[in-house]
């Protein structure tokens, strides 16, 4: 499955929008810094077949979409930027879903992919726990925004590697 060129553009647009969503200085939130244990190993792309990588990417985007679709998120971010960001993620999900359907027919997705998907879910669970612990404060959301920028960058790099494999 070849992800359309618009997909990588959407990726970049999502990152730009997320950068624009920043409302407060990251430096004023240093005391709230947190290691969420991003599962980098799931995004290095070396041990993956393409179908595996695509389903892990899909989980990453789906969880990001879910996180920024909550009421608490709506209260935290500028509405028009949040809507644009969500639209970009939704389009990426559609692209990836089409690929997942196509790739599963080509190669059987190994069971070990379940580990990777669960690792991504646990990562987002930690983010949600952190926000709850911090009572969804502006600084907590800023820390999470910076963290998601980092994780989406890993996703973008994995997609680039997938395109190079084609």
């Amino acid at each position: 499955c070849d992800l359309p060129q618009t997909h990588s553009l959407g990726n970049r647009r999502a990152l730009i929008l997320l950068a624009q969503m920043g409302r407060i200085s990251h430096f004023s939130c240093l005391k709230d810094r947190h290691d969420f244990g991003f599962p980098e190993e799931e995004f290095d792309g070396h041990q993956f077949q393409k179908a595996q990588a695509i389903s892990v990417l899909h989980e990453m985007i789906q969880q990001t979409f879910n996180l920024f679709s909550t009421e608490d998120s709506s209260a935290a971010w500028e509405q028009s930027l949040l809507e644009k960001f969500s639209t970009e993620l939704y389009q990426q999900l559609n692209d990836l879903e089409a690929c997942v359907i196509q790739e599963v027919g080509v190669e059987e997705t190994p069971l070990m992919n379940e580990d990777s998907i669960l690792a991504v879910r646990k990562y987002f669970q930690r983010i949600t726990l952190y926000l709850t612990e911090k009572k969804y404060s502006p600084c907590a959301w800023e820390v999470v925004r910076a963290e998601i920028m980092r994780s989406l960058s890993f996703s973008t790099n994995l997609q680039k590697r997938l395109r190079r494999k084609d």
Epitope: E42, E114, L118, K122, R126
Partner: antibody, heavy 122, light 107 residues
Framework: EMQLMESGGGLVQPGGSLRLSCVAS????????MSWVRQAPGKGLEWVAS????????YYAPSVKGRFSISRDNSNNTLYVQMNSLGVEDTAFYYC???????????????WGQGTLVIVST | DIRVTQSPSSLSASVGDRVSISCQTS??????LNWYQQRPGKGPQLLIS???TLQSGVPSRFSGSGSGTDFILTIISLQPEDSASYYC?????????FGQGTKVEIK
């Protein structure tokens, strides 16, 4: 009865390699993440590596990353660690450990083997 | 990596005493803090998971409390068989990290 039985420890020279094995019984091995934890004689515990229930999601301690490789064979209920470029600081009892969830993080180490001793020395 | 600091490093108490061991983490680990007991010459055994969940078969004199960064293991009435080393461990993220251990001796 749930049991973990390590083997493969012994004396090895610095720079050498060793492969440890752990056979599990009494529980559904393929449903849980597994870890290796080590303890230098008379010292505290140090987590080494973890592998997800299906053989994915491998994580390593910074001190062993690039030298150690964790793997599992669910058909034989066996956990492995391949240890390369061993140094004297790797001398320890190595414990095979069952985790409480299918992949590492947000869980606990709820069952331990008796340990196998690895000595790295000239 | 998350640093785990345990105190005291050792303690000596009498049978029947109430004993507490403290564990602090360098960042919040929510409730994902576990406690282990290791008797001399044996492998460790999980006592308490998720800060306060007592494992099956562990005597009720053991209890755990805390969340975030500060945790405590309490032995309500110390028994001779409790002579051992105790370790706390954060299971929140990898690399998993352990406290330095607390050696409990019976007077």
């Amino acid at each position: 009865e749930m049991q973990l039985m390590e083997s493969g420890g012994g004396l090895v020279q610095p720079g050498g390699s060793l492969r440890l094995s752990c056979v599990a019984s009494g529980f559904t091995f393929k449903s849980f993440a597994m870890s290796w934890v080590r303890q230098a004689p008379g010292k505290g515990l140090e987590w080494v590596a973890s592998v997800g229930s299906q053989g994915g999601s491998k994580y390593y301690a910074p001190s062993v990353k690039g030298r150690f490789s964790i793997s599992r064979d669910n058909s034989n209920n066996t956990l492995y660690v391949q240890m390369n470029s061993l140094g004297v600081e790797d001398t320890a009892f190595y414990y095979c450990v069952k985790e409480t969830d299918a992949v590492a993080t947000m869980d606990a180490l709820d069952m331990w083997g008796q340990g196998t001793l690895v000595i790295v020395s000239t | 990596d998350i640093r785990v600091t345990q105190s005291p490093s050792s303690l000596s108490a009498s049978v029947g005493d109430r004993v507490s061991i403290s564990c602090q983490t360098s960042q919040s680990v929510n409730i994902y803090l576990n406690w282990y007991q290791q008797r001399p010459g044996k492998g460790p055994q999980l006592l308490i998971s998720a800060a306060s969940t007592l494992q099956s078969g562990v005597p009720s004199r053991f209890s755990g409390s805390g969340s975030g960064t500060d945790f405590i293991l309490t032995i309500i009435s110390l028994q001779p068989e409790d002579s051992a080393s105790y370790y706390c461990q954060q299971g929140y993220i990898t690399p998993y990290t352990f406290g330095q251990g607390t050696k409990v001796e019976i007077k």
